[in-house]
């Protein structure tokens, strides 16, 4: 069966059908259809006029625009907001109400697109493998990146959040049109990976989405990963307009300036320093999303009940951080170069540079304490693989499972850990997992391309698909019209399950208690330790491009940074090294195919020896179930804030030192809304509340942007990366 | 100017099809998707279903599928609606409607068919 | 399919006044349109998304709202604005309000 042209709300558009073997099976393939007007610079997306006649939908349609890999020019176009949707058929009748899934890619908020990197004449986020094996329908999509998607004034003037409105636009476009293309509009999944992963849970949380979206997976990134929020948007809106010639001394002015700048010159205006750096695509990302005071309404730990009704599956890889540290600590990698405690207590430092001494040296203390035992190099390696995966990935997922869990009524979640190891060959044997390493599993590259994979790999992309997709259709991994190798139990805040994704699945693969110490390390005591004053906490500028990387100071010189008890906003981005440029989290379309090259010949990466799929191992002692992470108005997932937290905490009801661990009651309580003009955000509601989405705050065409800092002329942001 | 002319008023029996036609004239009959609405008496407005005069690509909305067959004749600029099956609820006046610019609203309308389905 | 719901269903006012209909979509819409349509007549387009006016309609009538409210305002109301108005949505499955039946005071 074929589908033939589909009407939508834009009018007939055609695709292509693709057979599948001898049996009669297909798949509907659409490329570029639509789902938003040609974006016009720093605006939010616009509604489609429209066509007449036939569209034919064949090809995929060029990424938003973006800077080149070596920063010297720009591709892509202002024209990008279209959306691709792979439709499985079997041989007689066209395919009715099928669970859809829409993958949102990742890419740091500064690159990417909806059909990723091209290797082996087979795009990354192709969706076929996805949609004919699970018998879901498949939708990617493009939508703005880097100072288009994201630059923001911090007020009405510019609000940002461009990109994430954007994706909205294709998640709304698709529930109003699926069902002509078989799916079923009340049976939407959002997944996606890294930034990609955050702004599934960012979707997820704003009240614009509004039963729009029935379940999500976030792999590798949640909304309360340190790198997804940015406190000091004008800080970095100033910077880009110094170089393109905007006046930066009244923001209405600047922002209509900026509106009117060639987007090509926006877009180079922000340049990352990659001198010296062994990977390009890891750099500090100043345009990322912002609280609005509309489209995300207050800080994202404060929205969980709206996603109460939201299955939810989130995971991390056991070494998502490897690909940062290496980048901070270039001797990760390198067999002949030893990682010595000085080198490691100085990353450890810049990640904890609000908390000064003291939380340099804690963190340092319980990081470093399986060293006496085993002093190895191979081991200290790790912990600095082990340290940045916690504090960018492990952590805040974990603390977002139990916001989601807290706040859920009928919703379930579910938790894992990627650890099939990395296939990039010039790695040591002990790395597992590397940041992104997923993505080709889930997209099923080891069927679609085999001659660069091994059949245990196929096996890990078998389950993998066979979970999200039963995942998709029920809401539960492990029911639905595919087999999977054991049984994934939901998570919950007792139990801590999480399921250990390997080659080889059994009973054993279900676990507890997924770093029990460290989550508990960062959730309670380092949040308690004192927060030093900005004069203490003074990062060293790196060398480099000064004019391309400022280097602000760490807060607000006229007040003490905030302790983050309360409200303190997001938390920062974390320091992660003296490279000058923060890692931030890589996609599969980051330029590099999925597969990890071996050179230029194309040949398969050689696979690497031994079973280095082992997750990292968690220190022995009280091994009982972690705690359950704040869901107060704590704001503060286990990085520290910086300087400019933001508005004073509202304290949390009753105890008013100790951050409020989530009730197991239902509370009944509603959310404060937060007015958008308020100078603290609303309390959360305390368990299963039964409340309300927090709404937007105000109209959305003209929304209030609560006050920052940053607006005042002296403060500029606290990025303690630098 | 653009101008639809519709056939006229038909009595037909339960169980019975009626084809009802479209003329257009004022423009180019294969640049704009026309749409057939109907309205029963004293009632709203309901959408039937949309053809693409240009390659004859339809669609219809999930109350009709089945019964329901647009189709055109560029030769003579004219698209038909074919209803089968017909039942007594199916009295009601069909409008045919062209798309204003785009994927716009119904911008043009025909002057409407009463059809009535009575034994 | 997405349900449109326009209030009031009838209304009675006067020449010169202002009048104001409302119309709610289900879920957050692209495209929504006002209708007018006289007794025996076809419909007649008079706003199309959402806030601009068909060509030869009078700059009496005015569109608003976006997302899942929308109103049609009549500014000063002319004998010849007594009708029943639609409002309509365009998704892949078009629907239309129940209707609001605009009648002299």
């Known amino acids: 069966a074929k589908l033939g042209a589909v009407y939508t709300e834009g009018g007939f558009v055609e695709g292509v059908n693709k057979k599948l073997g001898l049996l009669g099976d297909s798949v509907d393939i659409f490329k570029g259809i639509p789902f938003a007007a040609p974006t016009k610079a720093l605006e939010n997306p616009q509604p489609h006029p429209g066509w007449q006649g036939t569209l034919k939908a064949k090809n995929f349609k060029k990424r938003c625009l973006q800077a080149t890999i070596t920063q010297d020019s720009t591709y892509g176009d202002e024209d990008c907001l279209y959306l691709n949707i792979w439709v499985p058929q079997g041989r007689k009748q066209v395919s009715r109400d099928l669970p859809v899934m829409i993958w949102i890619y990742g890419g740091a908020f500064l690159m990417g697109s909806g059909h990723g990197a091209n290797f082996l004449n087979n795009y990354l986020y192709d969706g076929e493998e996805i949609a004919t094996r699970g018998n879901v329908i498949v939708v990617t999509f493009n939508y703005r990146v880097g100072p288009l998607g994201f630059l923001s004034t911090g007020d009405a003037n510019l609000p940002g959040n461009y990109g994430l409105r954007d994706q909205h636009m294709a998640i709304a476009w698709v529930k109003r049109n699926i069902a002509a293309f078989g799916g079923d509009p009340n049976n939407i999944t959002l997944f996606g990976e890294s930034a990609g992963g955050a702004s599934v849970s960012l979707q997820t949380l704003s009240p614009y989405n509004k039963g729009l979206i029935r379940r999500a997976i976030s792999q590798s990134g949640v909304a309360l990963s340190p790198w997804v929020i940015q406190k000091n948007p004008l800080f970095w809106a100033k910077k880009v307009a110094e170089k393109v010639g905007c006046p930066v001394g009244d923001a209405a002015r600047m922002a209509q300036c900026l509106k009117v700048t060639d987007p090509r010159a926006l877009t180079l205006a922000y340049k990352v320093p990659l001198a010296g750096l062994e990977y390009p695509m890891l750099h500090y990302v100043g345009f990322v999303p912002v609280i609005d005071g509309d489209f995300i309404p207050a800080d994202p730990i404060n929205l969980y009940a709206n996603a109460a009704d939201i299955d939810y599956i989130a995971g991390t890889n056991n070494m998502d951080g490897h690909i940062f540290a290496s980048i901070d600590m270039p001797a990760i990698n390198k067999g002949n170069k030893k990682v010595t405690e000085e080198d490691f207590y100085k990353l450890v430092s810049e990640f904890t540079i609000t908390k000064g001494l003291r939380g340099a040296k804690t963190t340092f203390d319980v990081y470093t304490e399986s060293w006496a035992q085993d002093p190895s190099q191979e081991n200290k390696k790790k912990t600095v693989v082990d340290f940045e995966t916690d504090v960018l990935f492990l952590v805040p997922t974990e603390i977002a499972l139990a916001q989601h869990r807290a706040n859920a009524k009928s919703a379930k979640t579910y938790a894992y850990l990627f650890s099939h190891p990395s296939r990039m060959p010039v790695y040591p044997k002990w790395v597992g997992a590397d940041h992104a390493d997923d993505i080709q599993y889930v997209f099923g590259k080891p069927f679609a391309t085999p001659t660069g994979y091994r059949p245990q790999d196929r096996t890990v992309s078998k389950a993998m698909i066979a979970y999200w997709t039963n995942f998709a259709k029920t809401g539960d991994p492990n029911m639905g019209d595919s087999a999977v190798p054991t049984h994934w139990e939901p998570y919950t805040t007792e139990n801590s399950g999480y399921l250990e994704i390997t080659k080889k699945m059994g009973s054993s693969s279900m676990k507890r208690s997924l770093r029990t110490n460290f989550l508990r390390y960062w959730t309670l005591t380092y949040l308690a330790l004192p927060t030093v004053t900005d004069q203490e906490a003074t990062p060293v500028p790196p060398t480099g491009d000064s004019e391309a990387t400022p280097v602000p100071p760490t807060g607000d010189s006229e007040t003490a940074p905030v302790p983050p008890t309360g409200d303190s906003g997001a938390p920062p981005v974390p320091p992660t090294g003296d490279s000058g440029a923060p890692p931030v989290p890589p996609t599969g379309d980051s330029g590099a195919p999925p597969v990890p090259p071996t050179g230029d010949s194309g040949a398969p990466p050689v696979p690497p020896t031994g079973d280095s799929g082992a997750p990292p191992v968690p220190p022995t002692g009280d091994s009982g179930a972690p705690p359950v992470p704040p869901t107060g108005d704590s704001g503060a997932p286990p990085v520290p804030p910086t300087g400019d937290a933001g508005p004073p905490p509202v304290p949390p009801t009753g105890d008013s030192g100790a951050p409020p661990v989530p009730p197991t009651g239902d509370s009944g309580a509603p959310p404060v809304t937060p007015t958008g003009d308020s100078e603290t955000a609303p309390v959360p509601p305390t368990g299963d509340s039964g409340a309300p989405p927090v709404p937007p705050t105000g109209d959305s065409e003209a929304a209030p942007v609560p006050p920052t800092d940053d607006s005042k002329e002296a403060q500029m942001p606290a990025v303690i990366r630098f | 100017q653009v101008q639809l002319v519709q056939s006229g008023a038909e009595v037909k029996k339960p169980g019975a099809s009626v084809k009802v036609s479209c003329k257009a004239s004022g423009y180019t009959f294969t640049s704009y998707n026309m749409h057939w609405v109907r309205q029963a008496p004293g009632q709203g407005l309901e959408w039937i279903g949309v053809?693409?005069?240009?390659?004859?690509?339809?669609s219809y909305a999930q109350k009709f599928q089945g019964r329901v067959t647009m189709t055109r004749d560029t030769s003579t600029s004219t698209v038909y609606m074919e209803l089968s099956s017909l039942r007594s609820e199916d009295t009601a006046v069909y409008y045919c409607a062209r798309d204003y610019y785009g994927s716009s609203p119904l911008g043009y309308w025909g002057q409407g068919t009463l059809v009535t389905v009575s034994s | 399919d997405i349900q449109m719901t326009q209030s009031p269903s009838s209304l009675s006012a006067s020449v010169g006044d202002r009048v104001t209909i409302t119309c709610r979509a289900s879920q957050s819409i692209s495209y929504l349109n006002w209708y007018q349509q006289k007794p025996g007549k076809a419909p007649k387009l008079l706003i199309y998304a959402a806030s601009s006016l068909a060509s030869g309609v009078p700059s009496r009538f005015s569109g608003s709202g976006s997302g899942t409210d929308f109103t049609l305002t009549i500014s000063s109301l002319q004998p010849e604005d007594f009708a029943t108005y639609y409002c309509h949505q365009r998704s892949s499955s078009p629907t239309f309000g129940q209707g609001t039946k605009l009648e002299i005071k």
């Open positions: 053809i693409n005069p240009g390659d004859g690509a339809t």
